[in-house]
């Protein structure tokens, strides 16, 4: 009578998360009596994945009937595999024994591997806004792929990034793997639309890559130029000056005029026009009554855009001996204006 | 708890037929492989036949083959024994027996009188 | 067809051993049953070999050796009493077989 073997066909198995894995073993023989049982690794500290004899191992089944009598076929199937089933697993015969069954011959071992899709990958950028001509570091992470090889890619509107470093973790082997990456983003003043896209290929995704953004509008801040100028008269002693608010990102925006350094009205920006870069314009006007002045006036629109230091410009408003002739701008005329921070 | 319920015994004349029933339940039925056996009057424990767990594989003793057959349903959790050519050896208690993994018995039913008598 | 002493006897308390011989130990795994009374539903003490199913009381134990099973009732009561079978299943033939009964009496 021949000796019995364990024959494990296949020398390794390749399946995708999710799905099920089939390990196939057969016994050449019934005799010596006694059960077949399934580990993962070798050795005392290898894990029971099926006992034949007794046991409950709610993700594993049968291939086969192995009530039949005759049955020699003691493949199983896994269901629901994780990157955490990966390793090699043994189809091992017992021989009855007292008290303890006795291990009689193992299969060669069969690998399984398991293949993960990458998570979806996150894009996060810096905690604090950056005004143009500034480099900002975004961040791109996915996690729980296998293999291990990966490809990640850094697109500004579409072009190809150059300048990022990329590491992938675990160095040595894992059961399933993360990457990271830092992406340098220099900034410009139209970027207010602009998106920061990290894409991931991985051999699970089957040529279709997964893809991260992050909107550089969440990023960038765009300050405020200003102009103030002076309008023609509206009514007698009265003159009506702009302060002219250009291209700032983002929308908060508080604007305060002062007349001689003392504050006159502060407002808020509310009904603001969008360029289309996508930053905004707003104008404040100022109705200053002449005849209230004895000295030239000093009349200072002061911004303070999204919580930064004020900016200003100033406008010198003469005050004329005849206020009539205010329109032929010899009264009331522009001196000049000159941009100062405020701190 | 398992409990296994022989019925269709009775009273035949020989070269008559009878179907044996036995109602399982207290497990899943369709995860084990069944048996019976009998015990003819003032006698020992006889294994007739055995069925696996599907259904497709079937085993007897030699002296029944050909006029014994061994069923079952699983969706109605039932074990059958269909008798033909009955003679007054086969007047016996019979039992339905559930299988271990390795083809031993573990659970009995209370049993099932058959009597084959002219 | 496997051998079994027709009966055996023993006092309260006492260790009773039953043997069963004619399987192959390599091919034969063996079982024991209980049977109080003829006709009545025999009850499973031991099977393969050496497992007890958890409502049998432990001072029932079994044990196979060569081509030999024993049955073993350390401190036997008087509701022991019984006919104890021994059945095996041969790998080889996929048969079950049964010995013929040991009547056992508690004195």
């Known amino acids: 009578e021949e000796e019995l073997q364990v024959i494990q066909p296949d020398k390794s198995v390749l399946v995708a998360a999710g799905e099920t894995a089939t390990l196939r073993c057969t016994a050449t023989s019934l005799i010596p009596v006694g059960p077949i049982q399934w580990f993962r690794g070798a050795g005392p500290g290898r894990e029971l994945i099926y006992n034949q004899k007794e046991g409950h191992f709610p993700r594993v089944t049968t291939v086969s009937d192995l009530t039949k009598r005759n049955n020699m076929d003691f493949s199983i199937r896994i269901g629901n595999i994780t990157p955490a089933d990966a390793g090699t697993y043994y189809c091992v015969k017992f021989r009855k024994g007292s008290p303890d069954d006795v291990e009689f011959k193992s299969g060669a071992g069969t690998e399984l591997s398991v293949r993960a899709k990458p998570s979806a990958p996150v894009v996060s950028g810096p905690a604090a806004r950056a005004t143009p001509q500034h480099t900002v570091s975004f961040t791109c992470e996915s996690h729980g792929f296998s293999p291990r090889d990966i490809t990640l890619k850094w697109f500004k509107n579409g072009n190809e990034l150059s300048d990022f470093q990329t590491n992938v973790d675990p160095v040595g082997e894992s059961v399933s793997y993360s990457i990271h990456s830092t992406a340098k983003v220099v900034l410009t003043r139209e970027d207010v639309h602009s998106q920061v896209i990290c894409e991931v290929a991985h051999v699970t995704l089957q040529g279709d890559p997964l893809r991260g953004t992050a909107n550089l509008s969440e990023t960038i801040r765009v300050p405020p130029t200003l102009e103030v100028t002076q309008q023609p008269v509206r009514a007698e002693n009265q003159v009506n000056v702009t302060c002219q608010v250009r291209k700032f990102y983002p929308q908060r925006l508080q604007l305060t005029w002062l007349e001689n350094g003392n504050v006159s009205r502060t407002e808020t920006a509310s009904t603001v026009t969008e360029n289309k870069d996508g930053t905004y314009n707003w104008m404040s006007w100022l109705l200053v009554n002449v005849s209230a002045h004895r000295d030239d006036v000093k009349l200072t629109c002061q911004v303070e855009h999204d919580g930064q230091p004020a900016v200003s410009k100033s406008h010198d408003l003469k005050v004329s001996a005849h206020p009539k002739e205010q329109g032929s701008n010899t009264a009331a005329e522009n001196t000049g204006s000159n941009e100062r921070n405020i701190y | 708890d398992v409990q296994l319920v022989e019925s269709g015994g009775g009273v035949v004349r020989p070269g008559e037929s009878l179907r044996l029933s036995c109602a399982a339940s207290?497990?899943?039925?369709?995860?084990?492989?069944m048996s019976w056996v009998r015990q003819a009057p003032g006698k020992g424990l006889e294994w007739l036949a055995g069925?696996?767990?599907?259904?497709?594989?079937?085993y007897y003793i030699d002296s029944v083959k050909g006029r014994f057959t061994i069923s079952r349903d699983n969706p109605k959790n039932s074990l059958y024994l269909q008798m033909s050519s009955l003679t007054a050896e086969d007047t016996a208690v019979y039992y339905c027996?559930?299988?271990?993994?390795?083809?031993?018995?573990?659970?009995w039913g209370l049993g099932t009188l058959v009597t084959v008598s002219s | 067809a496997l051998t079994q002493p027709a009966s055996v006897s023993a006092n309260p308390g006492e260790t009773v051993k039953i043997t069963c011989s004619g399987g192959?130990?390599?091919?034969?795994?063996y079982a024991w049953y209980q049977q109080k009374s003829p006709g009545s539903a025999p009850v499973t003490v031991i099977?393969?070999?050496?497992k007890r199913p958890s409502d049998i009381p432990s001072r029932f134990s079994g044990s196979a050796s060569g081509s030999a099973a024993t049955l073993i009732i350390t401190g036997v009561r008087v509701e022991d009493e019984a006919v104890y079978y021994c059945?095996?299943?041969?790998?080889?033939?996929?048969?079950?077989?049964f010995g013929a009964g040991t009547t056992l009496t508690v004195l």
């Open positions: 069925i696996s767990a599907g259904g497709s594989d079937t």
């Open positions: 027996a559930r299988e271990t993994w390795n083809h031993l018995f573990d659970y």
């Open positions: 192959d130990y390599y091919s034969t795994y």
């Open positions: 059945g095996g299943y041969d790998g080889r033939t996929y048969i079950n077989t």
């Open positions: 099977h393969s070999d050496d």
């Open positions: 207290g497990f899943t039925f369709s995860s084990y492989a």
